[in-house]
Interface confidence: low
Amino acid sequence: ARNGDHCPLGPGRCCRLHTVRASLEDLGWADWVLSPREVQVTMCIGACPSQFRAANMHAQIKTSLHRLKPDTVPAPCCVPASYNPMVLIQKTDTGVSLQTYDDLLAKDCHCI
Amino acid sequence: ARNGDHCPLGPGRCCRLHTVRASLEDLGWADWVLSPREVQVTMCIGACPSQFRAANMHAQIKTSLHRLKPDTVPAPCCVPASYNPMVLIQKTDTGVSLQTYDDLLAKDCHCI
């Protein structure tokens, strides 16, 4: 269930997809990846106020309990709901290989 | 990929399953749920230090970028990896019904 997409904190403040540019060095991949030299990493960033993009029943419960017991129960967290695949050209002992990673780039975000 | 289960912050501090007792009133369910009157809600709570229980490649990337750009990229977050089903006895117009919810109680946790 995808709950309210209206962000009560103002435009762009709540859980959404962001793009962060990263080099192979930033990612610690320089030793084993040849290409791409730079990755446009899509990630889920932002706040999860009450019922905003609640992923499921668990997220709704978390919101309720966070309101009651903020020191014990954290607010829901902005995480990927799905991913886009990405192909990396990797170094191997014999040369190079193409490897597809299905869990690398966030495609869509929700709160959980 | 499930990465390191050793918590560098000390026992019990990192992402793990916690049980939080909640009444129907706490959950805002008093109007539509008859039973149980109290729920032992299992949730994922705790810190996600570097590579601790990293759910996938995205979580590993997030850790690396959080270290480099803590202001821009949040640390990975402790969320359910799987759920346990739970049966609720619900009020209906004609009486009661049993409904199974598959996404209510966390079963296992990871960082993402």
Epitope: H18, R21, A47, H66 | -
Partner: antibody
Framework: QQLKESGGRLVTPGTPLTLTCTVS????????MSWVRQAPGKGLEWIGD??????TTDYASWVKGRFTISKTSTTVDLRIASPTTEDTATYFC????????WGPGTLVTVSL | DIVLTQTPASVEAAVGGTVTIKCQAS??????LAWYQQKPGQPPKLLIY???TLASGVPSRFKGSGSGTEFTLTISDLECADAATYYC???????????FGGGTEVVVQ
């Protein structure tokens, strides 16, 4: 790691004005940058911010198009489209979500 | 928009004493709160972020606590140099800054 605001001066109402925050010692692309103002004898007021990586902007709800934030590789600009006497204040830029580094401020006086 | 209400507006205390400043948010902001110190003619200085984490170089006499809607800044073993105005600020989420509280002036006798 430093910030320095410039461009503050005495202007008449309605005269557009651009303030500049020049950064040194760190990469703008890694941070959110905020503009905050303080009228004489009053408290701090958040105007808006820009993500140095993508240029995404966010503004306080009261801004309503009166201010525009933009960036280059080493500067963040605040344009006041049509200043009024209520915009008389010291304008500060701050680095990051937490504003861990601030410039000394630049004074804007709007007067007939 | 989130509104932060700071109390008291002004407080006096003696050197060596303790001051407590409260900040109330109009809705839960988890632990996304920062505290700043500002002296006349100077920009604000970050003291505490994420409600309780001490910023680099800030003495441990400054302590932040709270979560949800109620937050507190406690300054113990007051020094003359602590005379300033203190502001709380919502830093909701991990991507954006936001509103400030109205400020609390601390006078050290």
């Amino acid at each position: 790691q430093q910030l320095k605001e410039s461009g503050g001066r005495l202007v008449t109402p309605g005269t557009p004005l651009t303030l500049t925050c020049t950064v040194s010692g760190f990469s703008l692309s890694d941070y959110y940058m905020s503009w905050v103002r303080q009228a004489p004898g009053k408290g701090l007021e958040w105007i808006g911010d820009i993500y140095g990586g993508s240029g995404t902007t966010d503004y306080a709800s009261w801004v309503k198009g009166r201010f525009t934030i933009s960036k280059t590789s080493t500067t963040v600009d605040l344009r006041i489209a049509s200043p009024t006497t209520e915009d008389t204040a010291t304008y500060f830029c701050g680095r990051g979500i937490t504003a861990d580094i601030w410039g000394p401020g630049t004074l804007v006086t709007v007067s007939l | 928009d989130i509104v932060l209400t700071q109390t008291p507006a002004s407080v006096e205390a003696a050197v060596g004493g303790t001051v407590t400043i409260k900040c109330q948010a109009s809705q839960s902001i988890s632990s996304y709160l920062a505290w700043y110190q500002q002296k006349p003619g100077q920009p604000p200085k970050l003291l505490i972020y994420k409600a309780s984490t001490l910023a680099s170089g800030v003495p441990s006499r400054f302590k932040g606590s709270g979560s949800g809607t109620e937050f507190t800044l406690t300054i113990s073993d007051l020094e003359c140099a602590d005379a300033a105005t203190y502001y709380c600020r919502c830093i909701y989420g991990d991507s954006y800054g936001a509103a400030f509280g109205g400020g609390t002036e601390v006078v050290v006798q």
